[in-house]
């Protein structure tokens, strides 16, 4: 808190604003009849230096001139950039107890002259916007620095505006608030920025531009699209633009895409025909504008127009498969399955499927529509049947897909050979095979079909299948493949009117089963023991079981148990063993083996054969 300098004055030479590295002389003078009351000679003037209101130095030793009791001059050097406060105080040496009294103070600012402003850039947003220029001010001056932006153009007219930088605000941009209109399109303008502070001034190099150089058009607005005759592939994009626009850039993409289709349109006048759209697809459209074919800047992209193209009738053919099951001697159940068309083929929302089953010779036809991707009918076992399915949306139906209904596994000569299934990784299985050895007719295609080997899977879940061309002997199956689950895999070879198949089990990843089979009964028949069991629960199998092992040993024996290994068959749940001694009590148990190893043992059962066993 500096008093209003009642006791004296403080002056600075050469000035209170000095360049970095310069020294200054600060003189503190007492006014007449001020000072220590009785002994003027006891007046001692001291100078204190404050930075950010903190006392940093007593400049007692920096006196360069002293009129005892009246004035003192101090030299200050090595001042840091920014502002430093100096306070002169009077110390009356005869009264030690009294604190020094403030006389007066002064602020010295240390800075640098401004550098010439550089990289001037001016823009006007839209034909009706105003000119704003920005620049690089260069090094911080640490002083209040005024900047003047000056724009000169035709009609001998100059505009100018000012702003300043100090320790609180930075001035490197000014909006003149004046519009350059299209009637000045050919005119040249010169802009320069001048910087001035207490230590000097500097001016930028002149920067020359035209209306077309700096005006950035506003982005187009009111974007809409009109589909010609409700076409799903052709549309006219329309928009509003500023009057002077001569060039537009259009970009559009399906919403889930990562790359834009780009189109340049000259003199489009707010309209452009697009011919390569995908029907029934969500698109995003954006437009940018430019006022000049070669120079000038592109506008920002417009707001997006998001819309869906209309439907068109489906294209492509459905992938059909079927299952046949005999019901009795003269009836069979046909279950047809098909895969949904992909969006580019469906070209709209599929409303229903048209299904036809036809007996070729008697011309019997069964027809139906369904919203599902499967259809089941009971038909006679006699006759040659063919099926067809087509998909319909609001605009029409796809061409029907035909398939001949044959006995899929009826012809042994068409059965593929050496079918194998290898796990590739967690979610797929590589199936390979060799062609049928002695096929009567040419293989038209292979179908690889798979289904999880879990209870009820045949009735609950439709099959998964892949169509394979006749010259391919492998398929990588991945749809709905999960680790630690065993799948039944069938490879069908189909000719025009016959089918043969081979079956194998496979998994994509396996572990040893969680538990062994549960022995439910041991019975003695004709000098043989029959071991019966229940299969391991499906979730505990953890892959394809390759075989079961039956272990036995005499009770209380420490010898290694004997064992019998049985090839796994899903339908089998008992097995005979015949090497046990009569009237000896045995302990029996079972384990299960996958490619990953053997399960822990199942339950133990004791049994003592009675009859004469071999």
């Amino acid at each position: 808190n500096i008093d209003v300098c009642k006791l004296g004055t403080v002056t600075v030479q050469p000035a209170p604003v000095i360049p970095l590295g310069s020294a200054a002389n600060i003189s503190c003078s007492l006014n007449p009849k001020q000072g220590c009351s009785h002994y003027p000679s006891s007046n001692e003037l001291i100078l204190l230096k404050f930075v950010n209101d903190v006392l940093v130095e007593n400049l007692h030793g920096k006196k360069v001139h002293d009129h005892t009791g009246h004035s003192s001059t101090f030299q200050v050097t090595n001042l840091s950039l920014g502002m430093t406060l100096f306070v002169c105080k009077l110390n009356c040496s005869n009264s030690q107890k009294k604190p020094p009294v403030p006389v007066c103070g002064v602020e010295i600012s240390v800075g640098v002259a401004p550098e010439p402003p550089q990289n001037i850039s001016c823009v006007q947003e839209g034909e009706n916007g105003t000119v704003a220029c920005s620049w690089n001010s260069g090094k911080v001056t640490y002083l209040k620095t005024n900047y003047t932006l000056q724009l000169s153009g035709p009609n001998n007219l100059t505009c100018q505006k000012q702003c300043f930088s100090d320790n609180r605000q930075n001035c490197n941009r000014l909006d003149l608030g004046i519009n350059l209109s299209p009637d000045l399109a050919e005119s040249r303008f010169i802009v320069r920025v001048t910087a001035i502070n207490d230590l000097g001034n500097s001016s930028s190099l002149p920067h020359t531009f035209t209306f077309l150089d700096i005006v950035i058009p506003l982005p187009p607005w009111d974007i809409r699209i009109n589909f010609l005759n409700a076409s799903g592939s052709r549309g006219t994009l329309q928009w509003e633009d500023e009057g002077q626009v001569v060039l537009n850039q259009l970009r559009y993409q399906p919403l889930n895409s990562t790359s834009w289709n780009m189109v340049n349109a000259t003199n489009a006048k707010g309209k452009y025909d697009l011919r390569d759209l995908r029907p029934f697809t969500e698109y995003e459209f954006q437009i940018s504008s430019k006022l000049h074919l070669s120079g000038g800047s592109w506008s920002n992209w417009s707001e997006s127009l998001r819309t869906r193209t209309p439907e068109e009738e489906p294209v492509g053919i459905l992938d059909i498969w079927y299952m046949k099951q005999d019901i009795d001697y003269d009836r069979q159940q046909i279950s047809l399955f098909w895969k949904s068309l992909n969006p580019s083929e469906a070209r709209g929302k599929i409303l229903h499927y048209q299904v036809t089953l036809q007996e070729v010779t008697k011309k019997t036809t069964l027809q139906n529509t369904t919203r599902h991707t499967s259809w089941t009918r009971v038909i006679p076992r006699t006759g040659a049947w063919t099926a067809s399915v087509s998909a319909a949306n609001s605009k029409g139906a796809s061409a029907p897909t035909h398939i001949n209904i044959v006995d899929l596994c009826g012809t042994g000569l068409l059965a593929p050979h050496q079918v194998s299934a290898k796990s590739e990784n967690m979610d797929n299985i590589l199936v390979t095979w060799q062609p049928p050895k002695k096929a009567d007719s040419a293989v038209r295609e292979y179908i690889v079909e798979w289904r999880a080997l879990q209870p009820g899977s045949i009735t609950k879940f439709p099959p998964h299948w892949l169509r394979i061309p006749p010259d391919n002997m492998s398929a990588l199956i991945s749809e709905n493949i999960k680790p630690y689950i065993c799948y039944e895999i069938r490879v069908h070879a189909l000719s025009e009117s016959q089918g043969g198949c081979s079956s194998i089990r496979g998994d994509s990843k396996h572990k040893a089963p969680v538990s062994g089979p549960h022995i439910t009964a041991i019975t003695e028949k004709k000098e043989r023991l029959f071991i019966s069991w229940t299969h391991i629960p499906f979730p505990e199998q953890r892959g394809c079981i390759l075989h079961y092992r039956i272990y036995w040993k005499e009770r209380d024996s420490t010898a290694q148990p004997e064992l019998c290994e049985i090839q796994y068959r899903r339908s089998q749940n008992s097995h005979p063993i015949s090497s046990l001694q009569p009237r000896v009590t045995y302990v029996l148990w079972m384990t299960a083996v996958t490619a990953a190893g053997e399960s822990p043992q199942g339950n133990e059962r004791e049994f003592c054969p009675q009859g004469k066993a071999n």
């Epitope: 009706n128 153009g153 009609n155 007219l157 505009c159 100018q160 505006k161 000012q162 909006d175 003149l176 608030g177 004046i178 519009n179 350059l180 209109s181 009637d183 000045l184």
Partner: nanobody, 125 residues
């Protein structure tokens, strides 16, 4: 409605200075750009300086560096400080208020809606 009244004109020797002032009545003064025009005998009215609502200033080249336009929105006044006057500056000086927007609009007297009656400035050699 804005009424404008100029003052400060007079006779001055070449090289001298004058300060013209223009008082505006009406609450909407700061909505307008303010300008000074002049008309020498037998000549058309000529734009010399303007100040926008956001304090951008515009000058014709013949007065740039000699004349300074300023405004005080609190007092509803606009001033024209004229230094280094020349005999060819002799004219009737008019204050005007309007809403020009583009660079081309500012020198056009048709873009100004309100005018003062003028004050005579005579520069003798």
């Amino acid at each position: 409605q804005v009424q404008l009244q100029e003052s400060g004109g007079g006779l001055v020797q070449a090289g001298g200075s004058l300060r013209l002032s223009c008082a505006a009545s009406g609450r909407t003064f700061n909505n307008y750009a303010m300008a000074w025009f002049r008309q020498a005998p037998g000549k058309e009215r000529e734009f010399i300086a303007a100040i926008t609502r956001s304090d951008t200033t515009l000058y014709i080249d013949s007065v740039k560096g000699r004349f300074t336009i300023s405004r005080d929105n609190a007092k509803n006044t606009v001033a024209l400080q004229m230094n280094s006057l020349k005999p060819e500056d002799t004219a009737v000086y008019y204050c005007a208020a309007g809403m020009p927007y583009s660079y081309s609009d500012y020198p056009r007297d048709s873009k100004y809606d309100y005018w003062g009656r003028g004050t005579q400035v005579t520069v003798s050699s």
